[in-house]
Interface confidence: low
């Protein structure tokens, strides 16, 4: 007869490991007992369990509650056992020694491999601001056994770098994603992808990029200077900018206070029926936590009684 087993048994951490040992004997042969032991190199054999044809299963104290026979029906020639709830420390060499009648003793070895699936964590880098050079956007770390693979899935242009740290029973892999921040990256997903033989599918963690910026400011509303004449109703100036975080707007008049009746509504400055006292230099201030911008315009309210047209100057400053 001969023993049938596996060279390697692979399980995921926390799963039950079936350690196979089946005696394929000739007709009339019987298995008296099966002894299981752990036999790692450099250490003495440590008994797991003894499976006796008459007295049943005896489990050594070190494995109490963790070694069982497979559920019925059982073949009397099957000396396989279940090792419950495999942990990393169970990884190693195991031996089954089968005593048969009348053929004598047989033994076989197998290796138990315990996969530790990674539990990835994604850490965003420092705040991203337009104008920075190459900056860390995020780092992703995953530890497992064997070492996991850590990659990035994104449409954002960037560079990656990885490093690995070996521990006694596992390895930690950290991958960093660097980029040059630009406003077009705002809202773009950056996904860390972790692959491992102990995972049914890749694990993915997504980070949404936020890049602080503030666009140049400009003022609309003075495109046709002839519309800015005494008595006109509904005249308004609108300040144009964009930013992340969204900016706030403030209006002032450079050559004095805002005239009475002028309404400030966020990015818009609304005028009552125009009079000559509305002539002046108006400044739109745009700011967010990242930066601030100014844009100023000169308003000349025309008197239809006068023939000479007056010019409108637009100056933008930041």
């Amino acid at each position: 007869g001969e023993l049938e087993t596996s060279d390697v048994v692979t399980v995921v951490l926390g799963q039950d490991a079936k350690l196979p040992c089946f005696y394929r004997g000739d007709s009339g042969e019987q298995v008296g007992q099966v002894a299981w032991a752990r036999v790692d190199a450099g250490e003495g054999a440590q008994e797991l369990a003894l499976l006796h044809s008459k007295y049943g299963l005896h489990v050594s104290p070190a494995y109490e509650g963790r070694v069982e026979q497979p559920p019925p029906p059982r073949n009397p020639l099957d000396g396989s056992v279940l090792l419950r709830n495999a942990v990393q420390a169970d990884e190693g060499e195991y031996e089954c020694r089968v005593s048969t009648f009348p053929a004598g003793s047989f033994q076989a070895r197998l290796r138990l491999r315990v996969l530790v699936p990674p539990l990835p964590s994604l850490n965003p880098g420092p705040a991203l601001e337009e104008g920075q050079g190459l900056t860390l956007a995020a780092s992703c770390t995953a530890e497992g056994s064997p070492a996991p693979s850590v990659t990035w899935d994104t449409e954002v242009k960037g560079t990656t770098s990885s490093r690995s740290f070996k521990h006694s029973r596992s390895a930690a892999v950290t991958s960093e994603f660097h980029l040059v921040p630009s406003r077009s990256m705002n809202g773009q997903p950056l996904t860390c992808v972790v692959s491992h033989p102990g995972l049914l599918q890749d694990q993915r963690i997504t980070h949404i990029l936020h890049v602080s910026f503030l666009a140049e400011a400009s003022v609309r509303g003075l495109e046709d200077q002839n519309l800015w004449h005494i008595g006109r109703e509904g005249a308004m100036l609108k300040c144009l900018s964009e930013g992340q975080p969204p900016p706030s707007y403030n209006w002032t008049r450079l050559d004095g206070p805002l005239p009475s009746g002028v309404r400030v509504d966020g990015d818009t400055l609304g005028f009552p029926p125009l009079t000559t006292e509305h002539s002046g230099i108006y400044v739109c201030h745009v700011s967010n936590e990242f930066s601030s911008r100014d844009s100023q315009v000169t308003v000349d309210v025309l008197d239809p009684q006068e023939d000479s047209g007056k010019q409108v100057d637009l100056v933008s400053a930041s």
């Epitope: 926390g14 799963q15 709830n85 942990v87 539990l119 964590s121 497992g144 029973r169």
Partner: nanobody, 124 residues
């Protein structure tokens, strides 16, 4: 999004009992080792207990052995900490942790998943 939400913290007299619960969403807790840590005011965060993925294997800090019992209900994605014979020294914020590590005792806040914590106060 992964979330661990602890509940059950309270003010209790010395010698009393409490049961903490930790509900996990966004991941399959049954594949993870689950644990509890605690942090008393002015002290380092310390390991309390852990239960392995299948629920059969548990481990405790020496200071709580025999008084605390950790258990899990994989169907509900929940882990529990039954605390009996509470002492004033057990006063702390208790954190639920999910990980896969045999060395969960040495986990730091940058590793695994952590809850926000629940306050347990034991008065003498």
């Amino acid at each position: 999004e992964v979330q661990l939400v602890e509940s059950g913290g309270a003010l209790v007299q010395a010698g009393g009992s409490l049961r903490l619960s930790c509900s996990v969403s966004g991941l399959t807790a049954s594949r993870l080792t689950m644990g509890w840590f605690r942090q008393a005011p002015g002290k380092e965060r310390e390991f309390v207990a852990r239960v392995y993925a299948s629920g059969g294997l548990t481990d405790y800090a020496d200071s709580v052995k025999g008084r605390f019992t950790i258990s899990r209900d994989n169907a509900k994605n929940t882990v529990y900490l039954q605390m009996n014979s509470l002492e004033p020294e057990d006063t702390a914020v208790y954190y639920c942790v999910a990980g896969l590590w045999a060395d969960m005792r040495t986990m730091t806040s940058t590793r695994g998943y952590w809850g926000q914590g629940t306050q347990v106060t034991v008065s003498s």
